[in-house]
């Protein structure tokens, strides 16, 4: 049985300065090349090492790019989006949607979006047990008074 995976969606404005090798990332998606089913949006497929995006550090692989210099990326062919980035100029403003994976699964299941490696039950069970022991000890102590 798999856990239910939820996503925490946040938006961010990222300003990049074009480097010698461009903006330093690859994109996928578009109306003619859907990356996510039922979504023709433009997604970051790869961040190039030592490129402008990697050095900035905020853009992540899997991020959805909503706009470039205020130009909406909805319903674009893939190559139209590529050319928009290519001709966006030296200073480029990106509106980006990050999706942080959150695990709400069955006990003991650890999702890839939970990097800490401590399932919540491992914290809750001892706390609950301690509370019960404390309550039992308190009741016994009261009875002795």
């Amino acid at each position: 049985m798999n856990g239910r995976v939820d996503y925490l969606v946040t938006e961010e404005e990222i300003n990049l300065t074009r480097g010698p090798s461009g903006l330093g990332f690859n994109i996928v998606g578009g109306t003619d090349q859907q990356y996510v089913s039922n979504d023709s949006g433009i997604y970051v497929s790869r961040i190039k090492e030592n490129g402008a995006a990697a050095l900035d550090g905020r853009l992540q692989e899997g991020d959805k790019i909503l706009s470039v210099n205020g130009q909406d990326l909805k319903n674009l062919l893939h190559q139209d989006a590529v050319d928009l980035f290519r001709n966006a100029g030296y200073a480029v403003s990106l509106r980006v949607q990050h999706r942080l994976q959150v695990q709400n699964g069955p006990i003991g299941h650890r999702g890839e979006g939970d990097p800490s490696g401590i399932p919540i039950f491992m914290v809750l069970v001892p706390v609950f047990a301690l509370t019960m022991v404390a309550a039992w000890a308190f009741m016994r102590y009261r009875q002795q008074l």
Partner: nanobody
Amino acid sequence: EVQLVESGGGLVQAGGSLRLSCAVSGVSFRNMGWFRQAPGKEREFVAAISWGGDSTIYGDSVKGRVTISRDNAKNTAYLEMNSLKPEDTAVYYCAADGRFRAGRISSDLGLYHYWGQGTQVTVS
């Protein structure tokens, strides 16, 4: 994959007419241009049209004899050529601007990133 496919070329008598078509796929909202290249000569600008179809420019050698148009629903550009002369004999190329929704049309060959294979026009 971006593709531009020209059609409509052929052999025509001097004074005759031809209508060339250019079907575009893989890109949209592009300024479109027609260029031609005669044997042993450089590629020459013929005509261009804005992505919205509201603005056109023409090369000096064809002014008044050709009309460029487009049908965005079909993603196709056209070149209507009248009063053809033997010196119009060339391979005619269709090209799409490398910029998405570019502001100004241009005769500058360097701005056209996408090219068709060309269609031969021979005027006898």
